[in-house]
């Protein structure tokens, strides 16, 4: 999906009002400098691409993020403020339902959410251009 035509300010508002708190709640108990920041993004569409990937694509050691509160709110924000996004996700959602597993917070998931916090932080930068 190409995130170029999203309403970035509305997504930013959704992040600031709820998603950020949910990320903080998920990370509760984690040490500040426990994880190195290794994932980056250069503009807002790129940031959303990376955020989508880390939030919804299962990775080795962390298959469970898509059912977390921050993930569901991220999905809702993208569906509302990115034209055509929800249509592209129908197949992915159905595939995810088949894979549904017990929620387990692994260290790998915490590391991934730490990276997500960094990506959202970059997305929110006031001078970060759309292109």
């Amino acid at each position: 999906y190409d995130f170029t035509n999203c309403d970035f300010e509305k997504i930013k508002a959704a992040y600031l009002s709820t998603i950020s708190k949910d990320l903080i709640t998920y990370m509760s108990g984690t040490k500040s400098t426990e994880f190195n920041n290794t994932v980056s993004c250069s503009n807002r569409p790129h940031c959303l691409t990376e955020i989508q990937s880390l939030t919804f694509n299962p990775t080795a050691g962390c298959a469970s993020l898509a059912k977390e509160m921050f993930a569901m709110k991220t999905k809702a924000a993208l569906a509302i403020w990115c034209p055509g996004y929800s249509e592209t996700q129908i197949n992915a959602t159905q595939a995810m339902k088949k894979r549904r597993k017990r929620k387990v917070t692994t260290n790998k998931c915490l590391e991934q959410v730490s990276q997500l916090q960094g990506l959202w932080r970059r997305f929110n930068r006031p001078l970060l251009k759309q292109q």
Epitope: I24, S32, N37, G118
Partner: antibody
Framework: QVQLVQSGAEVKKPGASVKVSCKAS????????MHWVRQAPGQGLEWIGE????????DYNQNFRGRATMTVDMSTSTVYMELSSLRSEDTAVYYC???????????WGQGTLVTVSS | DIQMTQSPSFLSASVGDRVTITCKAS??????VAWYQQKPGKAPKLLIY???MRHTGVPSRFSGSGSGTEFTLTISSLQPEDFATYFC?????????FGQGTKLEIK
Amino acid sequence: QVQLVQSGAEVKKPGASVKVSCKASGYTFTSYLMHWVRQAPGQGLEWIGEIDPSDSYTDYNQNFRGRATMTVDMSTSTVYMELSSLRSEDTAVYYCALTGTINYFDYWGQGTLVTVSS
Amino acid sequence: DIQMTQSPSFLSASVGDRVTITCKASQDVVTAVAWYQQKPGKAPKLLIYWASMRHTGVPSRFSGSGSGTEFTLTISSLQPEDFATYFCQQYSSFTFTFGQGTKLEIK
């Protein structure tokens, strides 16, 4: 182990600028954010702003926007904080402090006293 | 900005006493609160993070609790080295803010 070593005390006149340094060691410099916090004599702690050494992006407390400037020297793993248009109420100890993406401060520099006096 | 209101500002106590310091946030900060100890002429030292997690090396007599808007730091049995100034800090949202401090003095 993580170490943050700051420059020495400064005495400045009102209207002047001061540049305080914070040399970091013991970790991957670009992996974490560096913040500056100040404390006026007998007062509480006030967050000034932060810099991401990986790309020099800065974010400031609104109270300091336009007066505080944070920069990075990658070659020496040093962060600088310059404060301009100094006034007497800027007399304080200035600390650098390190965080990851979670913003509480588990590592601090030793502090730099900046005195603004005519 | 979220305001952190700390009380009391001053506290006199004796060695062996149990003391409690309170911090109230002007809005919900989940559990994103840290507590610091500061001695004269020194940088603050992290004691507690995530409202209740003790930092490495912090004695077990220090404990934190709370969530949402009300947080407490408790020292179960004061030791001579605990007389210092204590600050709370919220890191739930930008700008990061501190309480005004509680100076703990020997009675």
